[in-house]
């Protein structure tokens, strides 16, 4: 799939209609949308491609990454390659600050969750962040979904402020990350 | 780029103890387990256990049980594996491997042959 | 322990030549499968992770594909450098394990 990457027109995209009719609880029936349709609008400043920057357009810049946060609904298996063909992973939170970034973000749509890059085989395997990195729930607490009809929650998601486990199979948005190096 | 650099090559008797070193450098040590994988001569892979460099958890191989020991020490960067009880069939080439994307062993050691003979 | 067996055991071929390994799990493992190729008195080396995700640096000559049980590891043309033996690593419960491998020789 191409990337095309879209300028920010500067006006409040919070007001283009979005998030209309696309609901945590109500994933039934998702549209297919370009990649180019299906980023986030955000309050957070984007870049515009008008400077340099290092991030593309219409990323959000915080510290040392840029964000995508993507509208098109997919698995968690299918978030992560979309990350990759636009050259970037599912969110890792690396800090406590990053953190508080991401749930600032997410938490102005309260109807949506975001796919991050956290996952693990089934319940008896430690969560792993994509890169194969170990999880630390120094960090943040993973509230768990399960239940005796769907016992193997093995993906996470963050919800406004919370960051709960679910089925992987089960469709959502999701957070791009693409780090540079300044 | 990331490295890891194992201990030398060692001889020992039935019933003694190994313990092989494994030094990271290229990337953040307490961030990725540990991997330990031996392979005897002539033969196949064998995964032995993991140990978190970051909160020293591990996690054994029912095989070794009892007589595996994982160890780390984070301000040099090194991982250990020791080895009690030795058998002649515990002959092997001992690797450790940093963990990667979907637990899978992306970093590899060169390699410590252990040889138990009497 | 989940059993991992590969087919063929060996097999010889030809530069250019397309190779397929399969790589069956005794049980399903989702797409937590690895794939490894191996050289006399070298360690390892990762080629694909998550079953058909490849490793950076890794030639786009090489490509898993399956889930659950049954995966393959495909060659698309055989290079002079590729003559090894591959292993494919399940990592879906403890202990992880490997299959006992593929021998790919000259033929």
């Known amino acids: 799939t191409m990337a095309i990457w879209r300028s920010n027109s500067g006006s409040n995209t919070l007001e283009n209609g979005y998030f209309l009719s696309r609901n945590k609880e109500n994933h039934s029936q998702p549209t297919q949308s370009s990649l180019e349709d299906s980023v986030t609008p955000t309050k957070a400043v984007k870049t515009t491609g008008v400077l340099s920057s290092p991030c593309p357009p219409n990323w959000i810049i915080y510290e040392k990454s840029c964000y995508l946060f993507s509208m098109s609904l997919n698995s968690w298996d299918g978030s992560k390659r979309q990350c990759w063909q636009l050259g970037s992973n599912l969110l890792k939170i690396d800090s406590s600050n990053e953190l508080g970034f991401i749930v600032k973000q997410v938490s102005s749509q309260p109807d949506n969750s975001f796919w991050i890059g956290l996952s693990r085989p089934q319940t008896e395997v430690p969560w792993l962040w994509e890169d194969g990195s170990t999880f630390s729930s120094n960090l943040f607490q993973i509230r768990t979904t399960a239940t005796q009809e769907n016992p193997s929650p093995n993906c996470v998601w963050i919800h406004v402020s919370v960051i709960y486990d679910q089925l992987c199979s089960v469709p959502s948005y999701s957070i791009c990350e693409k780090k540079f190096s300044m | 780029q990331v490295q890891l650099v194992q201990s030398g090559a060692e001889v020992k008797k039935p019933g003694a103890s190994v313990k092989v070193s494994c030094k990271s450098s290229?990337?953040?040590?307490?961030?990725?387990?540990i991997h330990w994988v031996r392979q005897a001569p002539g033969q196949g892979l064998e995964w032995m256990g993991w140990i978190n460099p970051n909160s020293g958890d591990t996690n054994y191989a029912q095989k070794f049980q009892g007589r595996i020991t994982m160890t780390r020490d984070t301000s040099i960067s090194t991982a250990y594996l020791e080895l009690s009880r030795l058998r002649s069939d515990d002959t092997a080439v001992f690797y450790c491997a940093r963990n990667s994307g979907s637990y899978s062993f992306g970093y590899w050691g060169q390699g410590t042959l252990v040889t138990v003979s009497s | 322990d989940i059993q991992m067996t590969q087919s063929p055991s060996s097999v010889s071929a030809s530069v250019g030549d397309r190779v397929t390994i399969t790589c069956r799990a005794s049980q399903g493992i989702s797409s937590w499968l690895a794939w490894y190729q191996q050289k006399p008195g070298k360690a390892p080396k990762l080629l694909i992770f998550?079953?058909?995700s490849l490793q950076s640096g890794v030639p786009s000559r090489f490509s898993g594909s399956g889930s659950g049980t049954d995966f393959t590891l495909t060659v698309s043309s055989l290079q002079p450098e590729d003559f090894a033996t591959y292993y494919c690593?399940?990592?879906?419960?403890?202990?992880?394990?490997f299959g006992p491998g593929t021998k790919v020789d000259i033929e």
């Open positions: 998550g079953a058909s």
């Open positions: 690593q399940q990592a879906y419960s403890f202990p992880f394990t």
């Open positions: 290229g990337y953040t040590f307490t961030a990725y387990y």
